[in-house]
């Protein structure tokens, strides 16, 4: 009754990507999905969690260079910690310097991902589209 | 000496995507890569062919819905056939109706892909970024 029941042979010149949830985008062994429906940050986070994923975490311009091509702006998993003034990801890690250009669009403690590695600060209650991400092991 | 030397077990709840050239985007078992360097249409086509791929072919809004998120514009594999006035892909197939909104930006016989399934007509000699695509079997 194992869940693992498919055997696949892969040519060395090419490679499979994943595994990812069905119909998600796979890139450099990370899984991404863009959700069209607008939700506030908390609802967006819950939606990603329900799919065994988290909101987008930007950790590498090289490994995630597909993000520079994304149009519009979407919730990501970056939140402001008022007590120490830092920006951190859902997993508790701190935003690395020079990864994102943070633009204070509005008063808020959440951030939208905007193309070319920009982060737009916004009120967490504002509905927006969002990006979920699942890192493969 | 077989090229096929990796055996992978895949959980039924998730799936692998591909196979694709290393570090390409995989989505719904198609492979995509966005190239930053600007080339004219012919050079772009040659670049894709050298990687065992072709310029982007848009064949399904559902299977290729990731394309609606792409910002800017990039050469795709669509060319105008002056003799019969039709638009066709590199493989000789005719552009399906309602797949792309064709916008006559310039006089030309080649087309750029622009977000939300638009095709911008452009002179084939103009340098632009481009999208290569490889369909998996």
């Amino acid at each position: 009754n194992s869940l693992f029941n498919q055997e696949v042979q892969i040519p060395l010149t090419e490679s499979y990507c994943g595994p990812c949830p069905k119909n998600w985008i796979c890139y450099k062994n990370n899984c991404y999905q863009f959700f069209n429906e607008s939700k506030n940050w908390y609802e967006s986070q819950a939606s990603c969690m329900s799919q065994n994923a988290s909101l987008l975490k930007v950790y590498s311009k090289e490994d995630q260079d597909l993000l520079k091509l994304v149009k519009s702006y979407h919730w990501m998993g970056l939140v402001h910690i008022p007590t120490n003034g830092s920006w951190q990801w859902e997993d508790g890690s701190i935003l690395s310097p020079n990864l994102l250009t943070i633009i204070e669009m509005q008063k808020g403690d959440c951030a939208l991902y905007a193309s070319s590695f920009k982060g737009y600060i916004e009120n967490c209650s504002i509905p927006n589209t969002y990006i979920c991400m699942q890192r493969t092991v | 000496n077989s090229l096929f030397n990796q055996e992978v077990q895949i959980p039924l709840t998730e799936s692998y995507c591909g196979p694709c050239p290393k570090n390409w985007i995989c989505y719904k078992n198609n492979c995509y890569q966005f190239f930053n360097e600007s080339k004219n249409w012919y050079e772009s086509q040659a670049s894709c062919m050298s990687q065992n791929a072709s310029l982007l072919k848009v064949y399904s809004k559902e299977d290729q819905d990731l394309l609606k998120l792409v910002k800017s514009y990039h050469w795709m594999g669509l060319v105008h056939i002056p003799t019969n006035g039709s638009w066709q892909w590199e493989d000789g197939s005719i552009l399906s109706p309602n797949l792309l909104t064709i916008i006559e930006m310039q006089k030309g016989d080649c087309a750029l892909y622009a977000s939300s399934f638009k095709g911008y007509i452009e002179n084939c000699s103009i340098p632009n970024t481009y999208i290569c695509m490889q369909r998996t079997v």
Partner: antibody, heavy 118, light 109 residues
């Protein structure tokens, strides 16, 4: 270079209708929300309506709700404002504007004058 | 809908600093943006968000916010800065609507 060119303004009687157009060029039109803002002669600016890049979401000021309809044709790179049941207080220069981000409008057209008078 | 209040007119000596203010309940929750409009011309965005300037806007323009008040400061006003200035914000009752202040006429003496 971003350009926005409004047209369709003119003189119309109270209760009448008018359709304004705004032809856009120099940017990927469908990627941006667009707005209409008006300015009565000698008065300040008043936000009228906005529409998302896809055209799927539309928003209106209370003063025009139910009378005006905003729309867009992304294949023609054109924004529209259909104005029905016009009143004297709708007399204004109507500007179309490209949204940089939500309420921030970074490019404006030169405007078209709508005069509602009998 | 919410309202934004601006002083109708402000004057400044050439080269001096002037502050134009905008008050409204919505400004407790949202940043204002500021538009410059010269006679017979379309408005131009000069400040948005906390204190962001679009490209081409001189750095003598800056924005700030405190409580229910937003401010536009011009440090070293130039003759070409003479214009009407409008603040703008999201409506506090509907995030999808926005509202302009009545405008401030700036005269550079």
């Amino acid at each position: 270079e971003v350009q926005l060119l409004e047209s369709g303004g003119g003189l119309v009687q109270p209760g009448g209708s008018l359709r304004l157009s705004c032809a856009a060029s120099g940017f990927t039109f469908s990627s941006y929300a667009m707005s209409w803002v008006r300015q009565a002669p000698g008065k300040g600016l008043e936000w009228v309506s906005a529409i998302s890049g896809s055209g799927g979401s539309t928003y209106y000021a209370d003063s025009v709700k139910g009378r005006f309809t905003i729309s867009r044709d992304n294949s023609k790179n054109t924004l529209y404002l259909q104005m029905n049941s016009l009143r004297a207080e709708d007399t204004a220069v109507y500007y179309c504007a490209k949204e940089l981000y939500r309420e921030y409008m970074d490019y404006w057209g030169q405007g078209t004058l709508v005069t509602v008078s009998s | 809908s919410s309202e934004l209040t601006q002083d109708p007119a402000v004057s400044v000596a050439l080269g001096q600093t002037v502050r134009i203010t905008c008050q409204g309940d919505s400004l407790r929750s949202y940043y204002a943006s500021w538009y410059q409009q010269k006679p017979g011309q379309a408005p131009v965005l000069v400040i948005y968000g906390k204190n962001n300037r679009p490209s081409g806007i001189p750095d003598r323009f800056s924005g700030s916010s405190s409580g229910n008040t937003a401010s536009l400061t011009i440090t070293g006003a130039q003759a070409e800065d003479e214009a009407d200035y409008y603040c703008n914000s999201r409506d506090s009752f509907s995030i999808h609507q926005n509202v302009f202040g009545g405008g401030t006429k700036l005269t550079v003496l």
